[in-house]
Interface confidence: low
């Protein structure tokens, strides 16, 4: 892989829709990792400092942002669904972490350059009381 | 998987003020429903995936659409998929 062309992801968490909460009594957070290349990423959800798997659904593979381009950057999405009660508890902390393997162009890594640096990029949200 | 009580809906999710990405969540639809890719290269739509809330013994299908286009709207995000009109839930402005 061309080490000169590595782009880490931008990560953002999107809050549940109040419409979903009132309609279903459930709350879905969406995590988007966008603009990364190559497509080696691992996405995980952490609730109150612990990794969670229940209620999580992540795209099986990253999506090419520009399918026509051979070297298109990639995106990945993931959903975390919890009960409305759990979301509305302001003490609850939700974090989406994307682990990205790669070397940036100006990296000062001094060991073997085949060994990837792990960059952890995360985005977070907190349970909301009535603001 | 078999979805017990499908209740298809499209919701608009809020990001931060400094994030110009709009996200639409299509969820709780029947497993026979397919989600089509967007013909607009600036609109990204994921394949459907299954989410399992094990503690509540509840499974749901979902797909996500997003775009940085200023005129992107959830009502048109999944226009290439067959979705009933009453599945769109407007997102009320937050007073926070």
């Amino acid at each position: 892989e061309d080490l000169k062309k590595v782009f880490p992801p931008k990560v953002a968490v999107f809050e549940p829709s109040e419409a979903e909460i009132s309609h279903t009594q459930k709350a879905t957070l969406v995590c988007l990792a966008t603009g990364f290349y190559p497509d080696h990423v691992e996405l995980s959800w952490w609730v109150n400092g612990k990794e969670v798997h229940s209620g999580v659904s992540t795209d099986p593979q990253p999506l090419k942002e520009q399918p026509a381009l051979e070297d298109s950057r990639y995106s990945l999405s993931s959903r975390l669904r919890v009960s409305a009660t759990f979301w509305h508890n302001p003490r609850n902390h939700f974090r989406c972490q994307v682990q990205f393997y790669g070397l940036s162009e100006d990296d000062e890594w001094t060991e073997d350059r085949d060994k990837p640096i792990t960059q952890k990029i995360s985005a977070e949200a907190w349970g909301r009381a009535d603001c | 998987p078999y979805i017990q009580n499908p209740d298809p809906a499209v919701y608009q999710l809020r990001g931060s003020k400094s994030n110009d990405t709009s996200v639409c969540l299509f969820t709780d639809f029947d497993s026979v429903m397919n989600v089509s890719q967007s013909k607009d290269s600036d609109v990204h739509i994921t394949d459907k995936t299954v989410l399992d809330m094990r503690s509540m013994d509840f499974k749901s299908n979902g797909a996500v659409a997003w775009s940085n286009k200023s005129d992107f709207a959830c009502t048109s995000a999944f226009k290439d998929s067959v979705i009933p009109a009453d599945t769109f839930f407007p997102s009320p402005e937050s007073s926070c």
Epitope: F14 | N19, C96
Partner: nanobody, 117 residues
Framework: EVQLVESGGGVVQPGGSLRLSCVAS????????YGWYRQAPGKEREKVAH???????DYADSAKGRFTISRDESKNTVYLQMNSLRPEDTALYYC???????????WGQGTLVTVSS
Amino acid sequence: EVQLVESGGGVVQPGGSLRLSCVASGSVHKINFYGWYRQAPGKEREKVAHISIGDQTDYADSAKGRFTISRDESKNTVYLQMNSLRPEDTALYYCRALSRIWPYDYWGQGTLVTVSS
């Protein structure tokens, strides 16, 4: 809006200690996460330590065992206690705050730490 003002930087000898402070003002009730970052001359800004409103902390490998992040909610202040300082800790240290959902992102102007004999 949130304003962040750092202080406590200065010149210190290797092995010495400093305590940096970051005072937040404005919509501080919405902040749920604070971090200290640093930028050495000619290098990229890097994470030093994070603290959440639940007082969960997270440190960069280079800071573990030497630096401690803490906060005083009553004073809207976050601290970075730095011990066993090394020359490679020389950098401009920035305070960061995130509010409600990333990235409602705020940064201070920075305070300079110089470790030199």
